[in-house]
């Protein structure tokens, strides 16, 4: 039986930070898991992975490329991210993995969220220089 | 029996303008057919449309939003999308249906493709007015 | 039918690295459903679980060899591997690949196991 | 992690025997009334061979005087009338935690 999971559809984030909720259909603190995110239409790319369970919040380890942390209670993840530039736009899907004890269970993949990080664009005006 | 669908997993634009190819696992020219673009994680907004057969080349049309036109050969219909602008980055996905004859055929939910439309910043700089 | 077979053992050097593989016949790795666990057991001694890698490609590994250790696999090959670092005496063994389902995670199928013995 | 203790370490009988051979956790491994604790049999140069399965469910192929029960902490494995094949090694193992634990074996040998 798959667990579902729901996430917001986009987040535009002009600063260079966001927080992304992963709502899931199952409580978290019922058997050890193993959260991440996961970036690109194929998921390519693992952006951010925590385990966990009842007994101790989970460390959180990012992909070279990125920044991450990570929080939940009984039925959200939430993964942020920092340091993000415009080429991190992309679409991130939430996944979660519940392995101990058994049996294994994992999420249907859900539609993802599209993060467009806007560009920062600051127009010096050009100050002739003093002699 | 469902079509496959392939598309590029993102397009970055510079320009305002984008060619989205759709190719499919079967062949156009054997029914009449419908293609249209999606935007959104859930495919919220038919972006544009085309309705085409072996005997004539479709007529696009696309939602208000957006500028569109298509085109199509045996396997492939491309999608060209102008005048966009920062906001239309987001996931597209490529939907074809087979009409007649029967039997109805569709295709299987792609991964879609991601467009992101980069902004283009142009700094003036400020020229004191003459008196 | 499902088969396991590992290959790679052999002699190596103290402060070494190996790499064992599994090639897995009868059943894909990166489908739903299955597991593959590595085992190992000294001359004479117990057994003694190393770590295992899910369809999905998640890990997890045994505290006492996390630092050393590497599982991961070819999809396109059927066929897991495992690596581990900074040899030592006590790492000699039979090496085994076991595949485990999703609902219990009991170990049904087995490989013929591969020795490593190190030492200069 | 979760210790397994398994008793006797050895012991020794006859074809036709009934033998008793015990595994204790440190901890129980019971989840939704499953007992995620199994049962290998493994005879000198071969790889192990799964015997029984949560607890109590014999693996398909094995022969019936095969058999395991308990829950929580405390499970048995049981051959009704031990034969000349079943001199071996005999491992329980838990999965209801990681790291996935070993009891440290029983030997059965003929006396």
């Known amino acids: 039986n798959k667990i579902l999971v729901k996430q917001s559809p986009l987040l535009v984030v002009d600063s260079n930070e966001v927080s992304l909720s992963c709502r899931y259909s199952y409580n978290l603190l019922a058997k050890e898991f193993r959260a991440s995110l996961y970036k690109g239409v194929n998921s390519d790319v693992e952006v951010c992975v925590g385990n966990g369970n009842f007994t101790y919040q989970p460390q959180f380890r990012s992909n070279a490329e990125f920044n991450c942390d990570g929080d939940f209670d009984n039925e959200t993840v939430t993964f942020r991210l920092w340091n993000l530039h415009v080429n991190h736009t992309d679409i991130y899907f939430c996944k979660i993995e519940f392995m101990y004890p058994p049996p294994y269970l994992d999420n249907e993949r859900s539609n993802g969220t599209i993060i467009h990080i806007k560009e920062k664009h600051l127009c010096h005006t050009q100050s002739s220089p003093k002699l | 029996n469902k079509i496959l669908v392939k598309q590029s997993p993102l397009l970055v634009v510079d320009s305002n303008e984008v060619s989205l190819s759709c190719r499919y696992s079967y062949n156009l020219l054997a029914k009449e057919f419908r293609a249209s673009l999606y935007k959104g994680v859930n495919s919220d907004v038919e972006v544009c449309v085309g309705n085409g057969n072996f005997t004539y080349q479709p007529q696009f049309r696309s939602n208000a939003e957006f500028n569109c036109d298509g085109d199509f050969d045996n396997e492939t219909v491309t999608f060209r999308l102008w005048n966009l602008h920062v906001n239309h980055t987001d996931i597209y996905f490529c939907k074809i249906e087979f009409m007649y004859p029967p039997p109805y055929l569709d295709n299987e939910r792609s991964n879609g493709t991601i467009i992101h439309i980069k902004e283009k910043h142009l700094c003036h700089t400020q020229s004191s007015p003459k008196l | 039918e499902v088969q396991l077979v590992e290959s790679g053992g052999g002699l190596v050097q103290p402060g070494g690295s190996l790499r064992l593989s599994c090639a897995a016949s009868g059943f894909s790795l990166s489908t739903g459903g299955v597991g593959v666990s590595w085992i190992r057991q000294a001359p004479g001694k117990g057994l003694e679980w190393i770590g295992e890698i899910y369809h999905s490609g998640s890990t997890y590994y045994s505290p006492s060899l996390k630092s050393r250790v590497t599982i991961s696999r070819d999809n396109s090959k059927n066929t897991l591997y495992l690596q581990l670092n900074s040899l030592r005496a006590e790492d000699t063994a039979v090496y085994y690949c076991?595949?485990?389902?999703?609902?219990?995670?009991?170990?049904?199928?087995w490989g013929q196991g591969t020795l490593v013995t190190v030492s200069s | 992690d979760i210790q397994l203790t398994q008793s006797p370490s050895s012991l020794s009988a006859s074809v036709g025997d009934r033998v008793t051979i015990t595994c204790r956790a440190s901890q129980s491994v019971d989840f939704h009334g499953i007992s995620f604790l199994h049962w290998y049999q493994q005879k000198p140069g071969k790889a192990p061979k799964l015997l029984i399965y949560a607890a109590s469910s014999l693996q398909s192929g094995v022969p019936s005087r095969f058999s395991g029960s308990g829950s929580g902490t405390d499970f048995t494995l049981t051959i009704s009338s031990l034969q000349p094949e079943d001199f071996a090694t005999y491992y329980c193992?838990?999965?209801?935690?990681?790291?996935?634990?070993f009891g440290q074996g029983t030997k059965v040998e003929i006396k």
């Open positions: 076991a595949r485990y389902e999703y609902y219990y995670y009991d170990f049904d199928y």
């Open positions: 193992q838990q999965s209801y935690r990681s790291p996935r634990t």
